[in-house]
């Protein structure tokens, strides 16, 4: 999670403020180090599918999780803050059986009004034999998922079935996709905001409208802010998502919801069933769909995927491969930015961003998306320098 | 059940305006677009424009463009058009109608009960 | 913007006979494989009432006698068999963008 592509030895952190290296016993220690401080903000993390909240513990230079012992809910507020979330996201939070955990973090409630990370010790016993889990927005929940579901070989999509899925115009015309993962946030690939769209004042999110012709600019969210990846490449599209923040926040409904970031320990399976949405053209070479369109496809494991028949070493651990390698369903041209999603424990979960392909739906060139299991940390960092 | 609650009739003098109200019960007032229509006696239905409760921000017929300005109240969950200087033209039945923008369709499938403006001096 | 006209301007149907009323748009309200041309009936002092959406498909509640047809421009409305409270003005409208027109109407009246 935190330590993915530090340019730092395995044993040292990387300051994002300054590039300098720490040592891990001096993360979260209570001491800022990195210039910026962000060594004593990026303590926490939700685990796994169900959402485990981990605090980092200096001592043990490692991942523990949060026993419920004493805990409250101004606390959750407090963790979900520190990711990047606002108050007003929070969701709820919930306690899970972990007695497979032999290591916690448990609150010290007589260390007074100090910061939450203070408070917190490591313990090998947790009492109520419960792990603190935080939903820090309500995420990843939809009305009805498609039909077997054009992009290229999907079907049109049902009202409310991927409320995350915004159309982003410049100029009234739809450019790329993208997915809500807060009433102020959207992630798209980075490619789609390449210069001149780099700057907020082309664009204009449409959200909760399935239809093309519906999308008039009085019912647009205008962007205030457009960031890309600092290492997006786009030669080889490494790299590719990019954030831009709305003007106003998003009113949620039953057609206007976010995706959930996926969390680290969420294991991807080969042959992992996933669903692509987007306005993209529903044949290569054609045109913007006017409907919303969404269509199954699989997970293709990296190393089939960078197989000399397949996209021969194009593929790097930034990137995630779906579709068919027999061809027929795939996303498009005008798909890109948009998302690729996968259901587990009932919650929908945003895996990938559309970024490339060699043309579209063609045998063995299965479409490539943005592994945004690589980015939350990049994203959590945005959202948190955003305040 | 879903409603849209409108008031029976206005009586207004020629030059002034009138606010028409359309409370809606029901339903998630944000997931609609709210639309208006209006119909003159014994005539066609025509459209006025809708508006976008999320947003707000309206989208107009051409021909309405001066005459009616739409609004909502989200915490009252009710839909407002104002028509301003009034001629006996604007003498007609208003409807507001809902729309299910989310859907691919864009058809009216609740609508108000309609409201008579009447503008005589 | 799509210019809807309708077919007759009134008609006098017998009970139990076949009503036919044909809607024609300007250019095709059909796209994505789907025709955006809707229904509703109207009876005096009430407000409008939908009953076919997408060209064929019924409204819940909407008795079977009346059934949708057609794409691209043109479109009809069937009722068969006609009941004395089918007597109402019937207006087509599409959706296939903003803004959205109505056709005049066409008034059905029994003989």
């Known amino acids: 999670w935190k330590f993915m592509g530090s340019k730092c030895s395995n044993s040292g952190i990387e300051c994002d403020s300054s590039g300098t290296c720490i040592n891990p016993s001096n993360w979260c220690d209570g001491v800022s180090h990195c210039p910026g401080g962000e060594d004593e903000n990026r303590c926490v993390r939700l685990y796994g599918p169900n959402f485990i909240l981990q605090v980092y513990s200096s001592q043990r230079k490692s991942w523990h999780p949060v026993c419920q012992d004493d805990w409250n809910e101004n606390y959750g507020r407090a963790a979900c803050r520190d990711m990047g979330y606002k108050n007003n996201f929070y969701s709820s939070q919930g306690i899970v059986d972990d007695s497979g955990s032999t290591s916690f973090m448990k609150l010290n409630t007589s260390a007074g009004n100090v910061d939450i990370y203070k408070k917190l010790y490591h313990s090998d016993a947790c009492s109520s034999k419960a792990v603190v889990s935080l939903r820090c927005i309500a995420c990843g929940v939809n009305l009805n998922s498609s039909r077997q579901s054009r992009i290229v070989g999907g079907e049109s999509a049902l009202p409310g079935a991927w409320p995350w899925q915004v159309s982003l115009h410049v100029q009234n015309v739809h450019v790329c996709g993208g997915s809500i993962i807060t009433p102020e946030w959207i992630v798209t690939a980075a490619h789609c905001v390449e210069k001149p769209l780099n700057n907020p004042w082309h664009w204009t999110a449409f959200a909760g409208i399935l239809r093309q012709s519906f999308m008039f600019y009085g019912a647009g969210y205008q962007v205030e802010k457009v960031i890309s990846h600092p290492n997006y490449d786009s030669k080889t599209k490494n790299n590719d998502i990019a954030l831009m923040k709305l003007q106003k926040p998003l009113t949620f409904n039953d057609l206007v919801k976010p995706v959930c970031l996926p969390n680290p320990g969420m294991m991807l399976q080969p042959e992992q069933l996933c669903w692509i949405s987007g306005w993209g053209a529903t044949e290569e070479k054609g045109k913007t769909s006017e409907v919303l369109n969404a269509a199954k496809v699989l997970l293709i494991e990296t190393q089939r995927c960078n197989s000399r028949y397949v996209y021969d070493n194009l593929i790097t651990p930034a990137m995630i491969c779906a579709g068919f390698l027999q061809g027929n369903v795939d996303s498009c041209q005008g798909d890109s930015g948009g998302p690729l999603v996968t259901s587990k424990n009932n919650i929908w979960w945003l895996i990938g961003d559309t970024s490339w392909g060699s043309g579209c739906a063609k045998a063995y060139r299965p479409g490539v998306y943005g592994n945004v299991m690589v980015f939350t940390d990049w994203i959590y960092r945005q959202m948190r320098a955003d305040g | 059940q879903v409603q849209l609650q409108q008031p029976g009739a206005e009586l207004a003098k020629p030059g002034a305006s009138v606010k028409l109200s359309c409370k809606a019960s029901g339903y998630t007032f944000t997931s609609y677009w709210m639309h208006w229509v209006k119909q003159r006696p014994g005539q066609g239905l025509e459209w006025i424009g809708l508006?976008?409760?999320?947003?707000?921000?309206?989208n107009y017929n051409e021909k309405f463009k001066s005459k009616a300005t739409l609004t909502v109240d989200k915490s009252s969950r009710t839909a407002y058009m104002q028509l301003s200087s009034l001629t006996s033209e604007d003498s007609a039945v208003y409807y507001c109608a809902r729309w299910d923008y989310g859907s691919s369709y864009g058809y009216f499938d609740v609508w108000g009960t309609g409201t008579t403006v009447t503008v005589s001096s | 913007d799509i210019v809807l006209t309708q077919s007759p301007a009134s008609l006098a149907v017998s009970l139990g006979q076949r009503a036919t009323i044909s809607c024609r748009a300007s250019?095709?309200?059909?796209?994505?494989?789907?025709?955006?041309m809707h229904w509703y009936q109207q009876k005096p002092g009430q407000p409008p009432k939908l009953l076919i959406y997408l060209a064929s498909n019924l409204e819940s509640g909407v008795p079977v006698r009346f059934s949708g047809s057609g794409s691209g421009t043109d479109f009809t409305l069937n009722i068969h068999p006609v009941e004395e409270e089918d007597a109402a003005t019937y207006y087509c409208q599409h959706s296939r963008e903003l803004p959205p027109t109505f056709g005049a109407g066409t008034k059905l009246e029994l003989k």
């Open positions: 508006i976008p409760p999320n947003s707000g921000s309206s």
């Open positions: 250019e095709s309200v059909s796209t994505s494989g789907y025709s955006y």
